[in-house]
């Protein structure tokens, strides 16, 4: 079965930046990744970045880059500042569309008893949506 | 299909505004950004910027900023592309698009004239 | 910004004619993550919008004829037309798909000899 992880980590340097990671351990191939903050895309959350393997990045404020790590993991890097800044228990979701499981989407947030620049290894985080 | 429907040609004057639309069939409109692009002959094809119908998330080219406004109406599917204080420069065809520019509306004919 | 640069501005060819056309690129386009290259092709023709042929550097829109191939990577890219028609008569843009903002190369406009 198809998993998702999530990973988010406060950089040291700037309390108010932070970085996501997640990846799919699937056999399938990538078409297209989605991550939103706030919950699931489509739930009440909203899109932080769009990325295609081989059409192009999209992404908005206040994600600064979002970019692919692997053939099957991305990263996104968030600048804090002002109103559209994330805070310490916020929600980041990916979703990841892959043919032919279908989508598969979870989310994670920064562990409660994380320093700065700290942050728990990459584990599958509870698959929340599979849409078949 | 994926289909993008834009509004009419507009003949206005120097210091005026006009609003562009662009209506999405076909697709989730809220999933995709939309495009915006400008059209002059002899100047090629310049992004203007985009918009992401669900949260109306938008992205500017530095160059239109001040002169382009983008908003989008999920419940309509249709995103509007406003331009202010038209001078001849702006005269020019302007698309919309979609899906990493896969698609495109028709265009529509901005004449900027006194 | 990444300028694209195009080259030749225009072309003149036969029918049945190979053609290749150039565009570089003043930043890489590679994505390292996932070694896939952010470029696009169009080709436009007169009254109407520009039509998505390449992306990714190399991989067809659907649609696509299989006479149109798309090479390269880094900052140097090739659009080659292995047997030109008359319907392919058309100026054909590249475009960074990389970084915002996305922009276009000035064109490269393909006539009949």
């Known amino acids: 079965t198809p998993e998702v992880w999530v990973q988010v980590r406060m950089e040291a340097t700037e309390l108010s930046s932070f970085t996501i990671r997640c990846g799919f351990l699937g056999s399938g191939s990538i078409s297209l990744v989605t991550v939103s903050w706030g919950g699931p895309n489509g739930a009440g959350g909203t899109t932080l970045a769009v990325l295609h393997p081989e059409r192009g990045i999209r992404q908005w404020a206040p994600a600064r880059q979002a970019r692919w790590e692997t053939q099957s993991s991305i990263s996104l890097i968030l600048e804090g500042s002002g109103a559209s800044s994330p805070c310490a228990n916020t929600t980041f979701c990916c979703k990841f569309a892959s043919f032919p499981e279908g989508s598969w989407e979870a989310c994670g947030s920064l562990p409660p008893s994380s320093d700065p620049g700290l942050s728990a290894p990459p584990t599958p985080a509870p698959i929340l949506r599979a849409d078949l | 299909q994926v289909q993008l429907q834009q509004s009419g040609a507009e003949l206005t004057k120097p210091g005026a505004s006009v609003k562009i639309s662009c209506k999405a069939t076909g697709y989730t409109f809220s999933t995709f950004a939309i495009d915006w692009i400008k059209q002059r002959p002899g100047h090629g094809l310049a992004w203007i910027g985009e918009i992401l119908p669900g949260g109306n998330n938008t992205n500017y080219n530095e160059k239109f900023k001040g002169k382009a406004t983008f908003t989008a109406d999920t419940s309509s599917n249709t995103a509007y592309m406003h331009l202010s204080s038209l001078t001849s420069e702006d005269s020019a065809v302007y698309y919309c698009s979609t899906y990493w520019f896969a698609y495109w509306g028709q265009g529509t004919l901005v004449t900027v004239s006194a | 910004d990444i300028v694209m640069t195009q080259s030749p501005s225009s072309l003149s060819v036969s029918a049945g004619e190979k053609v290749t056309m150039s565009c570089k690129s003043s930043?890489?386009?590679?994505?390292?993550?996932?070694?896939?290259?952010?470029l696009a092709w169009y080709q436009q023709k007169p009254g109407q919008p520009p039509k998505l042929l390449m992306y990714?550097?190399?991989t067809r829109e659907s649609g696509v004829p299989d006479r149109f191939t798309g090479s390269g990577s880094g900052t140097d890219f090739t659009l080659t037309i292995s047997s030109v028609q008359a319907e392919d008569l058309a100026v054909y843009y590249c475009?960074?798909?990389?970084?915002?903002?996305?922009?276009f190369g000035a064109g490269t406009k393909l006539e009949l000899k």
């Open positions: 990714g550097a190399s």
């Open positions: 930043q890489s386009l590679l994505n390292s993550g996932n070694q896939k290259n952010y």
């Open positions: 475009q960074n798909a990389h970084s915002y903002p996305p922009a």
